[in-house]
Interface confidence: low
């Protein structure tokens, strides 16, 4: 089969902060007289191919875009027939056409423009979750847990900050863990608490807030 | 480990429909899903695939019957199937991409199968 042809999703849509997988497949001419290995890359289009930099590639000598360093990766080895795209820590100006170039010297050099990549970056759309295990009762320590399961575990792990207008039983104001772990007082009840999360890696921030419900054991007594 | 759970299956007249479900077990985070078939006798054909950001991707021969969709928060992907005809007969397979890479290959999870028998 002498034929170029490339397999794969004409568009994909991820959330910032966000990774996602793009399943990729690759044929190119099996000329006896090329003796190189096949290389290959990710391009942005419109980039000219002999000043600008691939967005990720399987050579070890090329550079790539500082700007996608490592957030984009081809996964799969051309050598194989696999093209397959990972993109972490997705930004939104990573929205555009993206295409496949394969290399084999000395003979073969083909852009594959004609099945190009639409990436969609939207707007993270996603809360965490805070996690109360059982009820909160006054003078009792308790843990509570911020949580992101949508989170891709390959990206750059998130930074949590907890923040609270009137809770007294914290001594500062934010912690840098997802797990908060204080003793509410009675005079806490009704505060709000807010457990912000930071996708450093695309530089954005969600946010969930709730609102504190302190209950007294039987036999304490009210001020 | 990860295991898969598919269910829904079955014997269905020509016209009817099916709702085919798949769940992961054991921690893994879903970034892309499929659906694949293999009728007997023949090569196992993609069906469906979404990604995490809910975009999608039908076969021809079954683009406005069969609809994928997923639950994140359960780490499950779904395929419904209306106006299902005697050629949709054939073992479902899902496939979960949990986006990791083992000797710089991608890493795929695979159901068991669920056999779709359309006839009447």
């Known amino acids: 089969d002498l034929e170029f042809q490339l397999v794969a999703p004409e568009s994909v849509t991820v959330e910032e902060g966000l990774c996602v997988h793009v399943p990729c497949s690759v044929f190119y001419p099996s000329i006896k007289l090329t003796l190189g290995p096949v290389t290959g890359s990710w391009l942005r289009k419109g980039v000219s191919l002999h000043e600008d930099s691939p967005v990720a590639t399987s050579d070890p000598r090329q550079l790539v875009q500082k700007a996608t360093q490592g957030r984009f990766q081809l996964l799969g080895d051309p050598q194989k027939h696999d093209c397959s795209l990972f993109i972490r820590d997705a930004q939104k100006n990573d929205t555009g056409m993206y295409f496949f170039r394969v290399v084999r010297e000395p003979f073969v050099r083909y852009s594959y423009k004609k099945s190009q990549l639409s990436l969609h970056v939207t707007s993270l759309s996603r809360t965490p979750d805070i996690i109360i295990p059982g009820t909160l009762e006054a003078g009792y320590p308790s843990n509570l847990t911020c949580s992101v399961p949508w989170a891709c575990e390959q990206g750059t792990p998130p930074t949590f900050s907890w923040m609270s207008t009137a809770l007294t039983s914290l001594s500062s104001r934010t912690t840098d863990s997802s797990v908060l772990t204080f003793t509410p007082q009675p005079q806490d009840h009704g505060t709000k608490l807010t457990c912000l999360v930071t996708f450093s890696g695309a530089g954005v921030t969600v946010e969930r807030t709730i609102q504190l419900n302190v209950t007294r054991k039987s036999g304490q007594m009210r001020e | 480990e990860v295991q898969l759970v598919e269910s829904g299956g079955g014997l269905v007249q020509p016209g009817g429909s099916l709702r085919l479900s798949c769940a992961a077990s054991?921690?893994?985070?879903?970034?892309?899903a499929a659906w694949y078939r293999q009728a007997p006798g023949k090569q196992r054909e993609l069906v469906a695939s979404?990604?995490?950001?809910?975009?999608?991707n039908y076969a021809d021969r079954v683009a406005g019957r069969f609809t994928i969709s997923r639950d994140n928060a359960k780490n499950s992907v779904y395929l419904q199937m209306n106006s299902l005809r005697a050629e949709d007969t054939a073992v479902y397979y899902c496939?979960?991409?949990?986006?990791?890479?083992?000797?710089?290959?991608?890493?795929?999870?695979w159901g068991q199968g669920t056999m779709v028998t359309v006839s009447s």
């Open positions: 496939r979960l991409d949990p986006g990791l890479a083992l000797n710089n290959r991608p890493l795929y999870y």
């Open positions: 054991g921690g893994t985070f879903v970034i892309n």
């Open positions: 979404i990604s995490y950001g809910g975009s999608t």
